[in-house]
């Protein structure tokens, strides 16, 4: 704009971005994750982020462990505020079984299905939560491939907690993990030391998850 | 609500066996860890040992392994402490507690969320 | 086997005033696993604070915890008449459990 508010020069505006994403967040919930509370702290901190209803994003979450619970369905809630509250009242389901490809398999087959408020046409995205090698590893690959298959873009947390507090080697866990995550895994992996710790890494990966409405 | 549910209280003899029970109710009792703690008269509380219903794995303190026995049955949720032979050192109030944590691969962690009511054992 | 040491062992204090206990370890407590509990005559042990410093549910927020490494402390900013009670602090690092001796909080 000029002095005298005459247009010199005009730029076409950035194209909008679409708000839409379905979110399923994948939860172990086996005893070695400690303390919980933790979690929902993770929790609460990523989900205040998101911009929360049935035309923008939505969130559901999955807990496994020996077995698994849908704790809320993509269509849910409404607001952010609604699932900030839900989030925050899921309760640990416990267990000394992580049954990380059925989390997996499980939140592919029914978390993300039309019943339960996925939206046809939107990106599908996971985050898988987990601090210990599965039970079920033998099953992980094809898992894996069937979300990659659906194109579900996969983000994977790894707490070494447990492994820590035991002073055992995390090498193969966090390779498992990694296996997880979609490529590139630099971008779409991450570790914590411990379940304190996960409050740290929601920055970027809220910033990593927005990355993929452009 | 998770709720355990301790068994009544007990006069015993010396040399006496005796199995008292801790039911667990509004939670998955087969996926938490149960654990044991003795409180001797006007005394503080000592942990016993520990236990995990859904495949009975057993963790005892020292100063109590092979003077009690921790067993399950999860097909009744219900956990017990049990003597084979009881002494007048026994009597005390014994509580069962939820373990939120874990005790797998060698380590143990976490605090006891939920308690019973207790159980009084009295031996003379 | 780590030992705890609780001070003082009896509180004497009035509705109204704050409680400061304590609790230290005879070797570092590994993450600050520590866990505070209440017990009134005949009633089991209450949870109040476990990790340090965090409120178990339903706990007010005039009890507090803080410490790390040995020094633990519990306190209780304004007492109400349902505080007085025995307080014992536990650890949990260890793979084993062991309490403190315990602190009465009597009424002055």
């Known amino acids: 704009v000029s002095p005298t508010f005459q247009v010199v020069n005009s730029i076409a505006p950035v194209q909008e971005c679409s708000t839409q994403l379905d979110i399923v967040i994948v939860l172990d919930g086996s005893n070695s994750i400690y303390p919980w509370d933790s979690v929902t702290a993770f929790l609460n901190d990523l989900l205040e982020r998101m911009d929360i209803g049935p035309k923008q994003t939505q969130v559901g979450i999955v807990q496994y462990g020996e077995n698994v619970t849908h704790e809320f369905n993509l269509n849910k809630y409404s607001s952010t505020e609604e699932v900030l509250v839900a989030a925050n009242k899921i309760v640990q389901r416990g267990g000394r079984q992580t049954m990380t490809a059925l989390g997996i398999d499980t939140a592919r087959k029914e978390a993300f299905t039309e019943a339960r408020g996925a939206r046809r046409g939107v990106k599908k995205v996971m985050v898988i939560v987990t601090d210990g090698e599965s039970h079920d590893n033998h099953r992980l690959k094809k898992v894996i491939q069937d979300c990659e298959d659906e194109n579900i873009q996969r983000f994977s947390i790894a707490i070494l907690g447990s492994y820590n507090r035991g002073n055992l080697s995390t090498e193969k866990f966090v390779e498992e993990i990694k296996s997880i995550a979609s490529e590139p895994t630099e971008k779409h992996f991450f570790n914590v030391s411990d379940e304190l710790a996960l409050v740290t890494i929601v920055k970027t990966l809220g910033e990593r998850i927005f990355a993929l409405e452009a | 609500e998770v709720q355990l549910v301790q068994s009544g209280a007990e006069v015993k003899k010396p040399g006496e066996s005796l199995r008292i029970s801790c039911k667990g109710s509004g939670y998955s009792v087969t996926s938490y860890w149960i654990g044991w703690v003795r409180q001797m008269p006007g005394k503080g509380l000592e942990w016993m040992g520990i236990?995990?219903?859904?495949?009975?794995?057993?963790r005892y303190s020292p100063s109590f392994q092979g003077q009690v026995t921790i067993s399950a049955d999860k097909s009744i949720s219900t956990a017990y402490l049990q003597w084979s032979s009881l002494k007048a050192s026994d009597t005390a109030m014994y509580y069962c507690?939820?373990?939120?944590?874990?005790?797998?691969?060698?380590?143990?962690?976490?605090?006891?969320?939920?308690w019973g009511q207790g159980t009084l054992v009295t031996v003379s | 086997e780590i030992v705890l040491t609780q001070s003082p062992g009896t509180l004497s204090l009035s509705p109204g005033e704050r409680a400061t206990l304590s609790c230290r370890a005879s070797?570092?407590?590994?993450?600050?696993?520590l866990a505070w509990y209440q017990q009134k005559p005949a009633q089991a042990p209450r949870l109040l604070i476990y990790v340090a410093s965090r409120r178990a549910t339903g706990i007010p927020d005039r009890f507090s915890g803080s410490g790390s490494g040995t020094d633990f402390t519990l306190t209780i900013s304004r007492l109400e008449p349902e505080d007085f009670a025995v307080y014992y602090c536990q650890q949990y690092g260890t793979s084993s459990w062991t309490f403190g001796q315990g602190t009465t909080v009597e009424i002055k």
């Open positions: 070797q570092s407590v590994s993450s600050s696993y």
């Open positions: 507690a939820r373990l939120q944590g874990d005790c797998s691969g060698g380590t143990c962690y976490g605090h006891f969320d939920y």
């Open positions: 236990i995990y219903p859904g495949d009975s794995d057993t």
